[in-house]
Interface confidence: low
Amino acid sequence: MNGRVDYLVTEEEINLTRGPSGLGFNIVGGTDQQYVSNDSGIYVSRIKENGAAALDGRLQEGDKILSVNGQDLKNLLHQDAVDLFRNAGYAVSLRVQHRLQVQNGPIGHRGEGDPSG
């Protein structure tokens, strides 16, 4: 029997301090360029080496960003999301959704993913 791939979804508040090259990550998504089918959310596409996000270590490629400084990122055009990040200030609070892949055992013997990571 093959194992089944499940996902453990967790949310986290990440506070970043803007560095010389900004927040140090790229985003994809938005109502005009959906990254995930039927989801216009904003996702992290790349963490820049030695950038603010990389040095903090918590943000991961593939994470979904739910809000920036309390501002919901739902139903935004991609460019508006980009500008929201650019104008977010020096200290930036991100509400992030991590989607961790969990390889379970054979069906009927499901392993448990440890959310403490």
Epitope: D32, L77, Q79, D80, D83, L84, N87
Partner: nanobody, 124 residues
């Protein structure tokens, strides 16, 4: 891709009226402005409207003669111009604020990152 397309410019008699329109795509929730540039002169601020449409700002030179409005459902911004004078002759440009949901309307060219190609207004 951000696009601003102006329309409505034409030759009009002094004292006449005109309605300029700007179709916006690629950005939303932006303060929007109209600027103009007469031959041999610098581009100058005419009017601006907040992203929500609830506040407006006008240049002294057009106050009382010009009304800026927006239709967010149709992503358009309008500039209604009355009692036109020969000195209103210029290319009129629509512009979108570079800041997302900016709290305060700016009149400075530098705040407006996205520009249309312009529409010619000639008052004879």
């Amino acid at each position: 891709q951000v696009q601003l397309v102006e329309s409505g410019g034409k030759l009009v008699q002094a004292g006449g009226s005109l309605r300029l329109s700007c179709a916006v795509s690629g950005v939303s929730f932006r303060n929007m402005g109209w600027f103009r540039q007469a031959p041999g002169k610098e581009r100058e601020f005419v009017a601006a409207i907040s992203w929500s449409g609830d506040s407006t700002v006008y240049a002294d030179s057009v106050k009382g003669r010009v009304t800026i409005s927006r239709d967010n459902a149709k992503n358009t911004v309008h500039l209604e111009m009355n009692s036109l004078k020969p000195e209103d002759t210029a290319v009129y440009y629509c512009a979108a604020d570079g800041r997302f949901r900016a709290g305060r309307i700016g009149t400075s060219l530098g705040l407006y990152h996205y520009w249309g190609q312009g529409t010619q207004v000639t008052v004879s």
